[in-house]
């Protein structure tokens, strides 16, 4: 009598992750009696795939009907394919007893399941940096198969180069995981600014994934101060102006003191955007000469983002305002502006 | 699934033409497309693919002598300036449900023959 | 660009016979590499993706080995319609691009 085959023709299989898999196996003959396994992996760690006799396996159904009389067909599909699923799958007859002998396995078929890379997220730093100063985004996508993978940065459409990226894990592994770091260099003009991580993967059809970050979440672009005196008012009161200009973000609080005391405090609030995504914000006080007999010291102070007070200060003359209409005396700027880069 | 080339003829040197890949049974907005042509007696040759967003990447060689674009049901390739050695049969072909690594559904190919 | 070396440029067989062609990449494509049967006035036939698997439809007696820069597609015994000319195909996945072998003409000894 000829010797009991079993075939399983396909040396390999290549799925995409979420589609079925058909692993197919025929016997080349009835005899002898006993049923038919489906494993995956050899040897004593070998997980059980699929028995028609016992056990539930939501996952996989037989391809023809295995109870039907001289069936020879012990095909599978294995549906909702995921990259845990790869590995070699064997058919193995065992000839009926108690308990059932193994008889005779196939040759196996190697699973093979690509899977797209999740779309990237983009995280950028923690706290906001200043022009001129180095941030770094970070870009990571999971859930990819094969491995290969390429990752790319790019800056208003300008690809960047201070990258550093990493595929885990190293070794074989049935999904992998892909992390990467952008530096980027701020300066002023970056509020409107974007970066993106571009993903491309065999899987992906054509174009890459990306995931963007707005510089705007990482920058902080501090104020100028300019404190100016208008002309002197009929009612000898001066007006004096604090403009604050090209900042971002809009949180901002403004305090005039007159000779170190408090006089007012505001807070920026729906300020309209610069071309650049900046804002400006001027802020007038209104000083009676008449009221002071010594010359007036006032100081514009702007806290900025949380960040440590900005002081402007202005000396208004009150001698060289005669308690009479028509002086257009310009007041003399003793201050300076003390603004720093932080 | 099928694909069919159309707009292959005689054309002088210089003359723009453009054929086009009439596709049914799938989406054109799912799959990466790709052109390809053989000069008689001669090997296969990659021009161009177009993306399933409808970016289109070239060769090397190309250089701007082709445009691929696409519409619903369509995918063209554009002859900007033919000269006689763009005589070939031009195929156009889909990528694989597993990915644009390999090429699984061809059509039969148009012949273009650029003589003056 | 990948430069894809096919060999030999043409052989001859019988019916029966076990034929293999080679395909060579000038740098490595990992398992990136398709293999088509063209028969004369006819559109390629995918026979082999990812190196080693076997599209649908296709007998099994075609089969494909090799990664990184040496790949071989195998008939383990060569039928009468299957003289034809083969060609190897990469993708490389940092440059996208698509790079075919020269062919492999099989006529009939």
């Known amino acids: 009598e000829e010797e009991l085959q079993v075939i399983q023709p396909e040396k390999s299989v290549s799925v995409a992750a979420g589609d079925s898999a058909t692993l197919n196996c025929t016997v080349s003959s009835l005899i002898p009696v006993g049923p038919i396994q489906w494993f995956r992996g050899a040897g004593p760690g070998r997980e059980l795939i699929y028995n028609l006799k016992e056990g539930h396996f939501p996952r996989v159904t037989p391809v023809s009907d295995p109870t039907k009389r001289n069936n020879m067909d012990f095909s599978i599909r294995i549906s909702n394919i995921t990259p845990a699923d790869a590995g070699t799958y064997y058919c193995v007859k065992f000839r009926k007893g108690s308990p059932d002998v193994e008889l005779k396995s196939g040759a196996g078929t190697e699973l093979s399941v690509r899977a797209k890379p999740s779309a990237p997220v983009v995280s950028g730093p923690a706290v906001r940096a200043t022009a001129e100063h180095t941030v770094s985004f970070t870009c990571e996508s999971h859930g990819f198969s094969p491995r290969d993978i390429t990752l790319k940065w790019f800056k208003n459409g300008n690809e960047l180069s201070d990258v550093q990226t990493n595929v885990d894990p190293a070794g074989k592994s049935v999904s992998y995981s892909i992390r990467s770091t952008a530096r980027v260099v701020l300066t002023r003009r970056d509020v409107h600014s974007q970066v993106i991580c571009e993903v491309a993967h065999v899987t992906l059809q054509g174009d890459p994934l990306r995931g963007t970050a707005n510089l705007s979440e990482a920058i902080r672009v501090p104020p100028f101060l300019e404190v100016t005196q208008q002309s002197m008012r009929a009612d000898n009161q001066v007006n004096v102006t604090c403009q604050v200009t090209k900042f971002y973000p809009q949180r901002l609080q403004l305090t005039w003191l007159e000779n170190g005391n408090v006089s007012r405090t505001e807070m920026a609030s729906a300020l309209p955007e610069n071309k650049d995504g900046t804002y400006n914000w001027t802020s007038w006080l209104l000083v009676n000469v008449s009221a002071h007999r010594d010359d007036v010291k006032l100081t514009c102070q702007v806290e900025h983002d949380g960040q440590p007070a900005v002081n402007k200060s202005f000396s208004v003359k009150v001698s060289a305002h005669p308690k009479e209409q028509g002086s257009n005396t310009a007041a003399e700027n003793t201050g300076t502006n003390e603004r720093n880069i932080y | 699934v099928q694909l069919v080339e159309s707009g292959g003829r005689l054309v002088q040197p210089g003359t723009p033409l453009t054929l086009s890949c009439t596709v049914s049974?799938?989406?054109?907005?799912?799959?990466?497309m790709g052109w390809f042509r053989q000069a008689p007696g001669k090997g296969l040759e990659y021009i161009g693919i177009?993306?399933?967003?409808?970016s289109p990447y070239y060769a090397s060689w190309v250089n701007g002598r082709f445009t691929i674009s696409k519409t619903s049901t369509t995918m063209d390739l554009k002859m900007n300036s033919p000269t006689t050695e763009d005589t070939a049969t031009y195929f156009c072909?889909?990528?694989?449900?597993?990915?644009?690594?390999?090429?699984?559904?061809w059509g039969p190919g148009t012949l273009v023959t650029v003589s003056s | 660009d990948i430069q894809m070396t096919q060999s030999p440029s043409s052989l001859s067989a019988s019916v029966g016979d076990r034929v293999t062609i080679t395909c060579r990449a000038s740098?490595?494509?990992?398992?990136?590499l398709a293999w088509y049967q063209q028969k004369p006035g006819k559109a390629p036939k995918l026979l082999i993706y990812?190196?080693?698997f076997l599209y649908s439809g296709v007998p099994s007696r075609f089969s494909g080995s090799g990664s990184g820069t040496d790949f071989t597609l195998t008939i383990s015994s060569l039928q009468p319609e299957d003289f034809a000319t083969y060609y190897c195909?990469?993708?490389?996945?940092?440059?996208?691009?698509?790079?075919f072998g020269q062919g492999t003409k099989v006529e009939i000894k």
């Open positions: 177009i993306s399933s967003s409808g």
């Open positions: 195909q990469s993708w490389h996945y940092i440059s996208r691009s698509y790079t």
């Open positions: 740098q490595s494509i990992n398992s990136y």
């Open positions: 072909a889909r990528v694989g449900p597993l990915g644009v690594d390999y090429f699984n559904i």
């Open positions: 990812s190196a080693s």
């Open positions: 049974g799938f989406s054109l907005s799912s799959y990466v």
